[in-house]
């Protein structure tokens, strides 16, 4: 009866049962277990689980719990099992279960390891060596993401100054739910000498659009018009632009921020796909002007990492005043 | 001119539905997101959440998710805001705002006064 | 989620004097998202300045922002009588509480 439902909320269930950790991919981290042995035949199961620094608590009828996490340091699940969703319901004993990085001396794991969604079409990591590692060390990157079957390896390592690093393709596919995930990095070495380092790119951060093309500068009356072209693979409402115009008589500097802007003056060269346009006014014809732009992506589709495109090549126009 | 201008006041009891309205004019209307803004008597602004009517693609504060419901008709150039169930607390001035991709709130409607009261 | 903490909450100057507004976010943001509104009673609020210092159209050359990472300042060089008004910072989602300008 009702009674006895209640007594069985409130009596502590038996532990779980066969806890295991193991690893998929690179950095994503599975825990299974069985529900307790001996458990109140009333009970209907829920488990309460938390990692070792008391976050993500999760109250789940699920035996399993993943996260996605780089591998770079020990991470310990607790698990406990309980009759109701009641977060005030105290679960039975907790039990933990452990999962440690690979080994090695973590003075040799490579350092600053990070990458760049360049322009939605490939991804370019960075990395400083290790301190205790020695200079010939020949490193290899390895990545998985959610529209791989099997890990991939990078092909292509570079070296700049210090840093290390490797690009490999990756586009953005049609799938809306591509970019809510994330890309899983592991760097070693070919000889297994040193600790390897752990990263995850979430796809929807450390976006750099290429920069924009100018194809045109027209002037009318005292407006300037700029045409040009925008970077690839994005959508309209990701972008912006910034718009810089140098006068060299006066010295001044002026910066516009831009929404992709349909050409639709006579001045500008009409229906070009994939251009924008924007008039700057009260500028003086006789005088060099030279504009420059760069790309940005919005933050509500990319999240803000202050990463602007490369900017454009210059382009000038107008009169240089002889100094006379 | 860049306008936007919003529907009239609302005085409406707690459990009705209500829509209210916000249309642009002067600009490309598909090309910029629309905001909406909520201000308390009394309070300051907060950020409800934002429509892009090209594809109307909306994201929401959290705190107003599954509280209120974004829409636009790019055909009249005209982004709504809906209530299905207001409570006293929705009493309270509403503005929508074009909000360019760089998120500043550039042009601003006069505001709607919803008031809610049994 | 980043929070915006404006100060002062009330500033008493008189017309003629300077304005200084500070808004300083939780965490590290890009000056491009900054940006500074007035709102005067029972009107909408306007545009000052976006990109953290670029002043808006028709914004009169008094009003200047600055600033980078967590700490950003509206200033006000001379106030004018219709300057006296409540003003925010944002940045996307997240609005300061404000900061009310009142005649001395």
């Known amino acids: 009866d009702y009674k006895d439902d209640d007594e069985s909320r409130t009596e502590t269930q038996p532990p779980v049962t066969n806890l295991s950790v193991s690893v998929e991919n690179l950095c994503t981290v599975i825990w299974t277990w069985n529900p307790p042995e001996g458990a109140s035949s009333n009970c209907s199961l829920w488990y309460f689980s938390h990692f070792g620094d008391k976050q993500d608590k999760k109250i789940a009828p699920e035996t399993r719990r993943s996260i996605e996490v780089p591998l770079n340091e020990r991470i310990c699940l607790q698990v406990g099992s309980q009759c109701s969703t009641n977060e005030s319901e105290k679960p039975s004993i907790l039990v933990e279960k452990c999962i440690s990085p690979p080994e090695g001396d973590p003075e040799s794991a490579v350092t600053e390891l990070q990458c760049i969604w360049h322009n939605l079409s490939y991804m370019k990591c960075s990395w400083l060596p290790g301190r205790n590692t020695s200079p010939d060390t020949n490193y290899t990157l390895y990545y998985w993401h959610r529209s791989l079957e099997k890990i991939h390896q990078c092909e292509n390592i570079f070296r700049e100054g210090q840093y290390f690093g490797c690009s490999f393709d990756l586009t953005k596919v049609k799938d809306s739910s591509f970019e809510q995930h994330s890309v899983q990095i592991m760097v070693k070495d070919n000889a297994g000498k040193i600790k390897p380092s752990f990263n995850i790119v979430p796809l929807t951060s450390r976006v750099k659009p290429d920069p924009p093309h100018i194809k045109n500068l027209s002037f009318h009356n005292d407006d300037l018009y700029v045409q040009w072209e925008n970077p690839q693979n994005f959508i309209s409402r990701c972008l912006f632009y910034e718009v810089e115009v140098n006068n060299s008589q006066t010295e001044t500097h002026n910066v516009f921020y831009v929404q992709e802007a349909k050409c639709e003056n006579p001045e500008f060269e009409r229906n070009v796909e994939n251009t924008s346009c924007f008039m700057v006014p009260g500028v003086l014809p006789d005088t060099l002007n030279t504009v420059r732009i760069r790309v940005k992506t919005n933050k509500l589709c990319y999240e803000d990492d202050k990463l602007w495109s490369n900017w454009s090549q210059e382009m000038s126009i107008g009169k240089k005043r002889n100094s006379t | 001119e860049v306008q936007l201008v919003q529907s009239g006041a609302e005085v409406k009891k707690p459990g009705e539905s209500l829509k209210i309205s916000c249309k642009g004019s002067g600009y490309s209307f598909t090309s910029y997101w629309i905001g909406w803004v909520r201000q308390m008597p009394g309070k300051g602004l907060e950020w409800m959440g934002v429509i892009y009517p090209g594809d109307s693609y909306t994201r929401y504060s959290p705190s107003f998710q599954g509280q209120v419901t974004i829409s636009a008709d790019k055909s009249i150039s005209t982004a709504y805001l809906q209530w299905s169930s207001l409570k006293a607390s929705d009493t309270a001035m509403y503005y929508c705002a074009r909000f360019p991709n760089w998120g500043s709130m550039d042009a601003w409607g006069q505001g709607t006064l919803v008031t809610v009261s049994s | 989620e980043i929070v915006l903490t404006q100060s002062p909450g009330t500033l008493s100057l008189s017309p003629g004097e300077r304005a200084t507004l500070s808004c300083r976010a939780s965490q590290s943001i890009s000056s491009s998202y900054l940006a500074w509104y007035q709102q005067k009673p029972g009107q909408a609020p306007r545009l000052l300045i976006y990109g953290a210092s670029s002043r808006a159209t028709g914004i009169p050359d008094r009003f200047s922002g600055s600033g980078s990472g967590t700490d950003f300042t509206l200033t006000i060089s001379r106030l004018e009588p219709e300057d006296f008004a409540v003003y925010y910072c944002?940045?996307?989602?997240?609005f300061g509480q404000g900061t009310k300008v009142e005649i001395k």
């Open positions: 944002q940045q996307y989602e997240t």
